[in-house]
């Protein structure tokens, strides 16, 4: 039986070449977390396993820092950045929990003039 | 090449116990989780058992829990079984397999090692 | 339990033909979903997991789709290699369950 929930940051803005954390949260659970999976769209970003640690993707190396916590910190964004991110958790005996974060990425110019998502 | 290679199978009497190997290679084995699966005569799959990439997480059904041990030695790149209290039910091939390191599927499984119980 | 049913139990196609198998979940699943392959004497061999996504090396005349409770494979333009058992299996919830496979035969 499932009982957990994800609890997530929702929509979330930032600047071009700055950064931003992308956090989840698991709650409502006694399951023991086994491995969180980040992913944009269907691509890998970073795995957090409980006996192993992180393991960042080649590819994402140099913008991609673990944490905090089980978060993600994404840098030096670009517009390509915007988009669906995913929190995977895999528990036991739970299973699988997913979370979904949307992340846009704005020029600078149009974030200093407050254009922002607000998370509902 | 990725290789999983599973011996100590047999010919076994119910209440009896049994020690399943699976010595792998080429790849970093303390990197990945492993499991057991089987394959019962009638050819359905059922999950047996799972160990974390250190050891230091096991997880079972309720169908083996308290009968079946899982364990590894990440020395010798071995994944085991340690099987007791053995029912006619367990009778199957048993393989080892590897999990995809985002755990969502098996991505590499042995040749398999026959289990029969039976009196 | 999740139970995993799979249909149809056996499937005569010919060569060059496209065939479906479709994967029940009983209930949902997400996308956590993979199929495998087993040709008669041989090992399960990973095709498909979450839900469409090609395991490498695997051939692009298979496919897989679906998500929440209904999956389904498709291999098109069939191959005599094609011949096997196949099965799905979930990932959302322990224990993880397979559906009761699928022999495809050649007619």
């Known amino acids: 039986m499932m009982t957990g929930t994800i609890e997530t940051t929702g929509n979330i803005s930032a600047e071009k070449g700055g950064s931003i954390i992308l956090q989840c949260h698991l709650s409502s659970t006694t399951a023991q977390v086994t491995q969180v999976n980040w992913e944009q769209q269907d691509q890998l970003l970073a795995i957090c396993n409980a006996d192993l640690g992180w393991h960042i993707s080649p590819s994402f190396k140099d913008r991609v820092a673990p944490g905090p916590g089980l978060g993600l910190t994404l840098q030096s964004l670009t517009v390509n950045d915007t988009g669906e991110y995913f929190c995977i958790y895999h528990t036991y005996p739970d299973g699988t929990y997913t979370g979904r974060i949307f992340l846009e990425v704005l020029e600078s110019s149009v974030a200093e003039h407050g254009a922002r998502f607000q998370i509902p | 090449e990725v290789m999983m290679v599973e011996s100590g199978g047999g010919l076994v009497k119910p209440g009896g116990s049994l020690k399943l190997s699976c010595a792998a290679s080429g790849f970093t084995f303390s990197s990945y989780t492993m499991s057991w699966v089987r394959q019962t005569p009638e050819k359905r799959l059922e999950w047996v058992a799972t160990i974390s990439g250190r050891g230091g997480n096991t997880y079972y059904p309720d169908s083996v829990k308290g009968r079946f041990t899982i364990s590894r030695d990440n020395a010798k790149s071995t994944l085991y079984l340690q099987m007791s209290s053995l029912r006619s039910e367990d009778t199957a091939m048993y393989y080892c397999?590897?999990?995809?390191?985002?755990?969502?599927?098996?991505?590499?499984w042995g040749q398999g090692t026959s289990v029969t119980v039976s009196s | 339990d999740i139970q995993m049913n799979q249909s149809p139990s056996s499937l005569s196609a010919s060569l060059g033909d496209t065939i479906t198998i479709t994967c029940h979940a009983s209930q949902n699943i997400n996308v956590w979903l993979s199929w495998y392959q087993q040709k008669p004497g041989n090992i399960p061999k990973l095709l498909i997991y979450?839900?469409?996504t090609l395991h490498t090396g695997v051939p692009s005349r298979f496919s897989g789709s679906g998500s929440g409770s209904g999956f389904t494979l498709t291999i098109s333009s069939l191959q005599p290699e094609d011949i096997a058992t196949y099965y799905c299996?979930?990932?959302?919830?322990?224990?993880?369950?397979f559906g009761g496979g699928t022999k495809l035969e050649i007619k």
């Open positions: 299996q979930q990932g959302q919830s322990y224990p993880y369950t």
């Open positions: 397999a590897r999990w995809l390191l985002t755990y969502y599927a098996m991505d590499y």
């Open positions: 979450k839900a469409s």
